[in-house]
Interface confidence: low
């Protein structure tokens, strides 16, 4: 009779993480008598996966009933596959011996490859805000995928970006991989509503890529433009001076009025109007009692935006243009409000 052969018909098996792997193995003869064992890896350090004779292997089930006398099918199923299960599996026939069974024949091995989906890409931007015309870096990370081949693309508002660098780690062989990419984005004043998108395509995603997004509203700072104007009021001895604060983002803003360098009033932007591009406008006004001043008045609107150094705009108020009540001691009117 021809000597027993151990047949592993599948050179390789590809299984998605979480699924069950079937590793096929048949013997060509019932002789010699002895059990089958499954191992992962070769050499002295092989890892026992299943022993027909003894042991507890909760993830392994046999395809056929190994207790039947004429059984020659030693295929197994391994449940809940993870990337860590990847490797070469060998079906090994043992010959009954005393005191121990002796290895008789090994199958040629089946390479188990595990397909694992990448995690949802996480996009993170710079720690500090930046102003338009500056270049900022965004990073995208995704982990736990296998095989190693993966495609990553960057978009800004649907337009593909080209200035980015991507690494897949580790370089060598591994049960699963991670991808890390850094993209450079030039900010514009219109970017408050913009989004940066990192898109990851992998064989496990069946053409439906994963996306991670970052809102540029968390990255951009648009500094305000200031305009100070003077409006006449019905009362002859009063002047209304307004400070228009335009096109700023984020909303955090504090405004201080100075009369001849002395603080007159400080207020925080609250009731703002939003522009279509996501920036804000705000207006503050100051009612000045001209009769309280003998000389010309320098009015300054000073704005501190989002913790940045203050910017200011000044307006010179000519007192000589109001001769009436010039000697009066009435105090300048300090109350004011911001208007929508």
């Amino acid at each position: 009779e021809e000597e027993l052969q151990v047949i592993q018909p599948d050179k390789s098996v590809l299984v998605a993480a979480g699924e069950t792997a079937t590793l096929r193995c048949t013997a060509t003869s019932l002789i010699p008598v002895g059990p089958i064992q499954w191992f992962r890896g070769a050499g002295p350090g092989r890892e026992l996966i299943y022993n027909q004779k003894e042991g507890h292997f909760p993830r392994v089930t046999t395809v056929s009933d190994l207790t039947k006398r004429n059984n020659m099918d030693f295929s197994i199923r391994i449940g809940n596959i993870t990337p860590a299960d990847a490797g070469t599996y060998y079906c090994v026939k043992f010959r009954k011996g005393s005191p121990d069974d002796v290895e008789f024949k090994s199958g040629a091995g089946t390479e188990l490859s595990v397909r694992a989906k990448p995690s949802a890409p996480v996009v993170s931007g710079p720690a500090a805000r930046a102003t338009p015309q500056h270049t900022v870096s965004f990073t995208c990370e995704s982990h736990g995928f296998s095989p190693r081949d993966i495609t990553l693309k960057w978009f800004k508002n649907g337009n593909e970006l080209s200035d980015f660098q991507t690494n897949v780690d580790p370089v060598g062989e591994s049960v699963s991989y991670s991808i890390h990419s850094t993209a450079k984005v030039v900010l514009t004043r219109e970017d408050v509503h913009s989004q940066v998108i990192c898109e990851v395509a992998h064989v496990t995603l069946q053409g439906d890529p994963l996306r991670g997004t970052a809102n540029l509203s968390e990255t951009i700072r648009v500094p305000p433009t200031l305009e100070v104007t003077q409006q006449p009021v019905r009362a002859e001895n009063q002047v209304n001076v307004t400070c228009q604060v335009r096109k700023f983002y984020p909303q955090r803003l504090q405004l201080t009025w100075l009369e001849n360098g002395n603080v007159s009033r400080t207020e925080t932007a609250s009731t703002v109007t939003e522009n279509k591009d996501g920036t804000y406008n705000w207006m503050s006004w100051l009612l000045v009692n001209v009769s309280a001043h003998r000389d010309d008045v320098k009015l300054t609107c000073q704005v501190e935006h989002d913790g940045q150094p203050a910017v200011s705009k000044s307006h010179d108020l000519k007192v000589s243009a109001h001769p009436k009540e010039q000697g009066s001691n009435t105090a300048a009117e300090n109350t004011g409000s911001n208007e929508r």
């Epitope: 890896g41 070769a42 050499g43 002295p44 490797g87 010959r95 090994s106 091995g109 060598g172 062989e173």
Partner: antibody, heavy 123, light 112 residues
Framework: EVKLEESGGGLVQPGGSMKLSCVAS????????MNWVRQSPERGLEWIAE??????????HYAESVKGRFAISRDGSKSSFYLQMNDLRAEDTGIYYC??????????????WGAGTTVTVSS | DVLMTQTPLSLPVSLGDQASISCRSS???????????LEWYLQKPGQSPKLLIY???NRFSGVPDRFSGSGSGTDFTLRISRVEAEDLGVYYC?????????FGSGTKLEIK
């Protein structure tokens, strides 16, 4: 193509240290035990160390002549393994080969060898 | 350690002749799993050793059938039925059953 490639050899003074590297390609590196073997005219072929798989907690074994002086390690992410050699002696001079047990689970044997890297210990 | 003793040290042969190399281990080299991990290697000048025979008598893939191995316990033999020019070099036996693994001292096969 199944391949092992050693590097890191050279000239070192007695008592000195040296680290050899071996990069594997063309086979599933994590599945196999890795070995270092050296050769010199005086001592012939001499097996010196082996390192097991992750599933065997990277167990190591050494020849008596290098125990306590040499340390074998592996880095699966780089498909590489290493031999850190300390307190080198003249008798450690030779060609160092990395080699591995592969192919068949029941029939292990050193069937893949690198081309070797030469270590010379001399003052 | 298991000492592997090879004889002869040098073996002059004519092409087409049969050649036999002996290897004796200082102790039984049967592994605890029942297998005997006795291997034979050929090393040609300037090259690393190449595996010929594993587990006493199994020819490694690509090795011509003129090479055969035999033996058990502590005594092992490598035979080359008809020596060809490409067979010249140094032959080593090796035991992979007991740590530390050990090689024989080598047998140089050369032309008479």
């Amino acid at each position: 193509e199944v391949k092992l490639e050693e590097s890191g050899g050279g000239l070192v003074q007695p008592g000195g240290s040296m680290k050899l590297s071996c990069v594997a390609s063309g086979f599933t590196f994590r599945n196999y035990w890795m070995n270092w073997v050296r050769q010199s005219p005086e001592r012939g072929l001499e097996w010196i160390a082996e390192i097991s798989l992750k599933s065997n907690t990277y167990a190591t074994h050494y020849a008596e002549s290098v125990k306590g002086r040499f340390a074998i390690s592996r880095d699966g992410s780089k498909s590489s393994f290493y031999l850190q050699m300390n307190d080198l002696r003249a008798e450690d001079t030779g060609i160092y080969y990395c080699t591995t047990f592969t192919k068949v689970v029941a029939d292990w044997h050193l069937d893949v060898w690198g081309a070797g890297t030469t270590v010379t210990v001399s003052s | 350690d298991v000492l592997m003793t090879q004889t002869p040290l040098s073996l002059p042969v004519s092409l087409g002749d049969q050649a036999s190399i002996s290897c004796r281990s200082s102790q039984n080299i049967v592994h605890s799993n029942g297998n005997t991990y006795l291997e034979w290697y050929l090393q040609k000048p300037g090259q690393s050793p190449k595996l010929l025979i594993y587990k006493v008598s199994n020819r490694f893939s690509g090795v011509p059938d003129r090479f055969s191995g035999s033996g058990s316990g502590t005594d092992f033999t490598l035979r080359i039925s008809r020596v060809e020019a490409e067979d010249l070099g140094v032959y080593y036996c090796f035991q992979g059953s007991h740590v530390p693994f050990t090689f024989g001292s080598g047998t140089k096969l050369e032309i008479k």
